[in-house]
């Protein structure tokens, strides 16, 4: 996988009036490493690993750059015409990548009310607009505003990409994304019984890198895909990842099932606890992982945040 640096910014408007401030977070190699504190108006480390490795200068620089980007995004939102009443959002995702062959990529993507309306390649300055008439109108609105804005030149896009790559290289050198291996902690639980069946869930947590195989086996043989339910592999905020797999089995057949895990050349099988050792979860056995808001405003205002 290529090394990547990604910034996610969002500004909001209420009844046509653009709100002050903005929301932002940063990801390094898919891991959250930066969050923007809206109250203190500062970029802060996300997770102990970022805090330990990146110095104060990083957060000063990031604060300056994010403030500038946030202001740009707010100005862009003011130029989006026909904003109906209520709450609206404009989101920008900016990504730069360094691939194994040392080639680079850079792009940014804009979403209005959670809907993608413009993608730009920062290296070629090519733009892509989805087919929908709403996206076409929004893209035209925004690009027309940028044409009037002297800052939005090709030189500016190149500088944007160069700046992103420079940061990515600096962060990689400082060892934030050292390719260490952290083996997963695996734990198997059983949910309540219904109609003679139980749901067994196998959770792998605190592992790095993110590539993992997690599957249920019956008598040593992998169950078919359609009998298993997988969760996404998600960052857990500590520079490591978590995921799960679940399946339904007949009560009394626990001994036949094991959760098989393979990660970075290591593997293990984990049996279903049975009899007195059976771990019963509470009724809440839903496995949906919600994107936790960067800030309470997300939850309160139910804004869709694109990862």
């Amino acid at each position: 996988e290529p090394h990547s640096l990604r910034y996610n910014l969002m500004v909001l408007s209420q009844d046509g009036s653009v709100q002050s401030g903005f929301l932002a977070e940063g990801h390094l190699d898919g891991q959250p490493f930066l969050r923007y504190d809206r109250q203190k108006r500062r970029a802060k480390p996300q997770g102990q690993w970022a805090e330990d490795v990146l110095g104060a200068k990083t957060w000063d620089t990031e604060t300056e750059d994010l403030t500038e980007n946030g202001q740009d995004l707010r100005r862009t939102l003011t130029h989006i015409k026909d904003q109906k009443g209520g709450l609206h959002s404009l989101q920008e995702i900016r990504v730069c990548e360094i691939h194994e062959d040392s080639s680079t990529r850079g792009s940014r993507h804009f979403y209005y009310d959670g809907e993608l309306f413009l993608s730009q390649n920062l290296e070629t300055q090519e733009s892509t607009v989805p087919q929908s008439s709403r996206a076409q109108t929004l893209a035209m609105n925004v690009t027309n505003f940028w044409k009037e804005d002297a800052m939005k030149t090709k030189t500016h896009y190149r500088a944007m990409q160069a700046d992103c790559l420079q940061k990515l290289q600096r962060y990689l050198k400082s060892g934030v994304a050292i390719r260490r291996t952290v083996p997963p902690m695996v734990n198997v639980t059983c949910s309540e019984v219904s109609e003679g069946n139980i749901t067994v869930t196998c959770r792998a947590s605190s592992f790095y890198p993110r590539n993992i195989t997690l599957t249920w086996r019956q008598d040593g043989v992998s169950l078919s895909h359609n009998t298993q339910q997988w969760g996404d592999v998600l960052p857990d905020g500590n520079g490591t990842y978590q995921t799960w797999v679940a399946t339904r089995i007949r009560q009394g057949e626990e001994q036949r099932f094991t959760c098989y895990m393979e990660h970075s050349g290591n593997h293990g099988t984990h049996p279903v606890p049975s009899g007195k050792a059976l771990v019963l979860q509470s009724q809440r056995t839903d496995h949906h992982h919600h994107h936790h808001g960067l800030n309470d405003i997300f939850e309160a205002q139910k804004i869709e945040w694109h990862e």
Epitope: R217, D219, G220, V221, S222, E253, Q255, R256, T258, Y260, H267, G268, T269, H270, P271
Partner: antibody
Amino acid sequence: EVQLQQSGPELVKPGASVKVSCKASGYAFTKYNIYWVKQSHGKSLEWIGYIDPYNGGTVQNQKFKGKATLTVDKSSSTAYMHLNSLTSEDSAVYYCATTDGYSLFTYWGQGTLVTVSS
Amino acid sequence: DIQMTQTTSSLSASLGDRVTISCRASQDIGNYLNWYQQKPDGTVKLLIYYTSRLHSGVPSRFSGSGSGTDYSLTISNLEQEDIATYFCQQGNTLPFTFGSGTKLEIK
């Protein structure tokens, strides 16, 4: 190439015990179960049980509980089946087998003939 | 325990023939049916798993079919090297059980 090499033939007296070995090679031993199967002379096959080499967990056919004990030695990638209190009924060829994770008894050992006779 | 019945204990056929060996389970085994070949020297090989999936390296002249309680193994073009005893086995319910075997001979 996956290979299961079993120990040689055994001639044992009634009441004695025997330990059949199955040395695995060509794959990561702790990844896949080892299964044991019995074939009495001129008869069909009977599943005895299996062991998960990673954690030593076993699942057995009730019929063979108390008769067969399954163990592994991870350091030598070898599975063992210990048969006790032998009688003429235990005279048979015993096979070990393993899986590729997709099918049962995917690869088989060559079999070990155990003869119980006074 | 689930009983696996192979009614034909031995079968004679000529080289090039299409041969079908059947196997019946005493209850529905939901396609968890495997076929094994045992050569006269005792060597055992997996041929087909999950009713119809051909194990890697097994010639395509072997095929399997069936559902519920009735299953079959077909050899489309019998060759000399196919002379062996064929066993079916269910993997649906413990204990795993095998059929009594069908010995295939050349006419």
